[in-house]
Amino acid sequence: VPGEAEQPAPELVEVEVGSTALLKCGLSQSQGNLSHVDWFSVHKEKRTLIFRVRQGQGQSEPGEYEQRLSLQDRGATLALTQVTPQDERIFLCQGKRPRSQEYRIQLRVYKAPEEPNIQVNPLGIPVNSKEPEEVATCVGRNGYPIPQVIWYKNGRPLKEEKNRVHIQSSQTVESSGLYTLQSILKAQLVKEDKDAQFYCELNYRLPSGNHMKESREVTVPVFYPTEKVWLEVEPVGMLKEGDRVEIRCLADGNPPPHFSISKQNPSTREAEEETTNDNGVLVLEPARKEHSGRYECQGLDLDTMISLLSEPQELLVNYVSDVRVSPAAPERQEGSSLTLTCEAESSQDLEFQWLREETGQVLERGPVLQLHDLKREAGGGYRCVASVPSIPGLNRTQLVNVAIFGPPWMAFKERKVWVKENMVLNLSCEASGHPRPTISWNVNGTASEQDQDPQRVLSTLNVLVTPELLETGVECTASNDLGKNTSILFLELVNLTTLTPDSNTTTGLSTSTASPHTRANSTSTERKLPEPESRG
């Protein structure tokens, strides 16, 4: 072509895939008349006529560009729509008059790749591999031109390093003309890389400048041999009988070795293997003092058959023995004295307390309780509590019953009970004394007796309310070797118009239940008279 040697460098037009490229013919009026121009595409040094301009009117030539070209800017600019990577070539416009001149445009096409897709080695990497192992792959799809990949470890770019880091990349051309970049990072890893964060970055260019996209960060499973094995006990701190205790083996290797836990036999001093659960944990539930002793863990690497032993660990399950009280069953006359002594053993220092069983009142802080000038009210339960103050919840108790000799003593002397005729009445009578009394009733009915404690008895009587019973009332009599005592129950008919009982009566403790003799299913509440001062 005449004058081609003097051609200046082509004008550069940059455009993204899918958008429209505006190819402006840069011929000056002196170089050619823009109303008479031919447009060519140049591919592999071969020119192909793609568009003609005649008298300012444009006409596409048949071929790959036929549907995508149009004239703009009064014929000076050729618009190419839906740009593809295949359009990256030189376009030239050639003026016909006064003499043949041409203007060249280099079209550069760009497309950002998709987000890089990183996949980590799912099987992991041993630290002792002979050569760099595959750590992760990175795929950047559908970019143009080919993006550049950079691998990072903990935010620092990785460089090729002989026998340590190798990055292998390749690209494939899709049918669209876009490139898919694939890269694999191979590296020799060390134990410290178990927490390392790897990611890949794609660097690419667009008309707007340089850009990059990063993958998500990944960690790689790193396998390294165990160097140390140790025991861990849960819960941490002082252990006590009854606790759930877990003893587990731990190791600093990945994967962990096969564990076994053994306890030293105190008599033979031999280590005896304990039975662990499926997770290799020795569970002591409930822990007992016999579980105390020296434990150790063995870790066996099944690949190398190397065995490692932990430091032994002393386990102490704190305990309080059964509490003993002397005398065990004290009996005393009224007015006499009594000394109660409490004993127990423990793995720790003990504190003792004496409490009154019925009220929970603390009587003494110490192992000895002295009771003087005993009254019959002093009879009943006394509890010794032996506890370890440094270990909350570690305690044992023993109840002792103090018996004060005396005749029966009634819970009440007299009581008024509101009743209806023909109902079955449920009456109760309570007495205490030492020896424990027995209770009899002055009327026929079904009676049953329950021992409440060594000195106290409760008798219940089921009886049908008859006119005779209303007249006589009911008496219960308690007797023992030292005497007898009686309680009286007065029966009063309920008047249906009476909504409230006399103001001097109080609600009783027992109820009387309707029986088949009554016409209605009703319940009668027992009422009792104000209790007298003395109940003896």
Epitope: P122, I125, K130, E134, T137, V139, I184, R216, P221
Partner: antibody, heavy 118, light 106 residues
Framework: EVQLKESGPGLVQPSQTLSLTCTVS????????VSWVRQPPGKGLEWIAA???????YYNSAFKSRLSISRNTSKSQVLLKMNSLQTEDTAMYFC????????????WGPGTMVTVSS | DIQMTQSPSSLSASVGDRVTINCKAS??????LAWYQQKPGKAPKVLIF???SLQTGIPSRFSGSGSGTDFTLTISSLQPEDFATYYC????????FGQGTKLEIK
């Protein structure tokens, strides 16, 4: 053309050792890892073991104590040994190539049937 | 170990139908998933990798989607040669396969 082919004894006595060979062509064992996958009759697929392009060996923990995988790069062969066979080990055994830039299996051998029976 | 659960276990469809097969992972596997097709007496063949990338040479009627724990294989218009058993496989931590979905002719 990438090809893999498994070969083995077909029938194995219970408690005996199984030896399988996977012979490959069209690629190098130093550029692609190879795995063994098995499929009991009428059942699903189960990954057994792998050897990476660098020669690192991996095993399914369910079989680890009775497996051994190795390779002979000059013969383009991957070998699998499994001892203490039981009737439950009756299956079709496949070897499969790991794609060079991914972790899935892009080429598989046709498989070899192994029956464990006395 | 990561468990892979496929649903349904079997499926009847006709030529031309649009079919979806689901796969659920017991934990997040991002997009570390492949789909395979297996015909009786044959080895499995990879269709989709990285959850949504079509393997070279596989017809475009096959597509994969999903990320994290839930994944889907879609066949947009069933062809006679598509009746087979389909397996999903995770490669995020070790290798595990789904139990398979048998696609049968209705």
């Amino acid at each position: 053309e990438v090809q893999l082919k498994e070969s083995g004894p077909g029938l194995v006595q219970p408690s005996q050792t199984l030896s399988l060979t996977c012979t490959v062509s069209g690629f190098s064992l130093t550029s692609n890892g190879v795995s063994w996958v098995r499929q009991p009759p009428g059942k699903g697929l189960e990954w057994i073991a792998a050897i990476s392009s660098g020669g690192t060996t991996y095993y399914n923990s369910a079989f680890k104590s009775r497996l051994s995988i190795s390779r002979n790069t000059s013969k383009s062969q991957v070998l699998l040994k499994m001892n203490s066979l039981q009737t439950e080990d009756t299956a079709m055994y496949f070897c499969a190539r790991r794609y060079g830039y991914g972790w899935y299996f892009d080429f598989w051998g046709p498989g070899t049937m192994v029956t464990v029976s006395s | 170990d990561i468990q892979m659960t496929q649903s349904p276990s079997s499926l009847s469809a006709s030529v031309g139908d649009r079919v979806t097969i689901n796969c659920k992972a017991s934990q997040n596997i991002y997009n570390s998933l492949a789909w395979y097709q297996q015909k009786p007496g044959k080895a499995p063949k990879v269709l989709i990798f990285n959850a949504n990338s079509l393997q070279t040479g596989i017809p475009s009627r096959f597509s994969g989607s999903g990320s994290g724990t839930d994944f889907t294989l879609t066949i947009s218009s069933l062809q006679p040669e598509d009746f087979a058993t389909y397996y999903c496989q995770q490669f995020y931590s070790g290798y595990t396969f789904g139990q398979g979905t048998k696609l049968e002719i209705k």
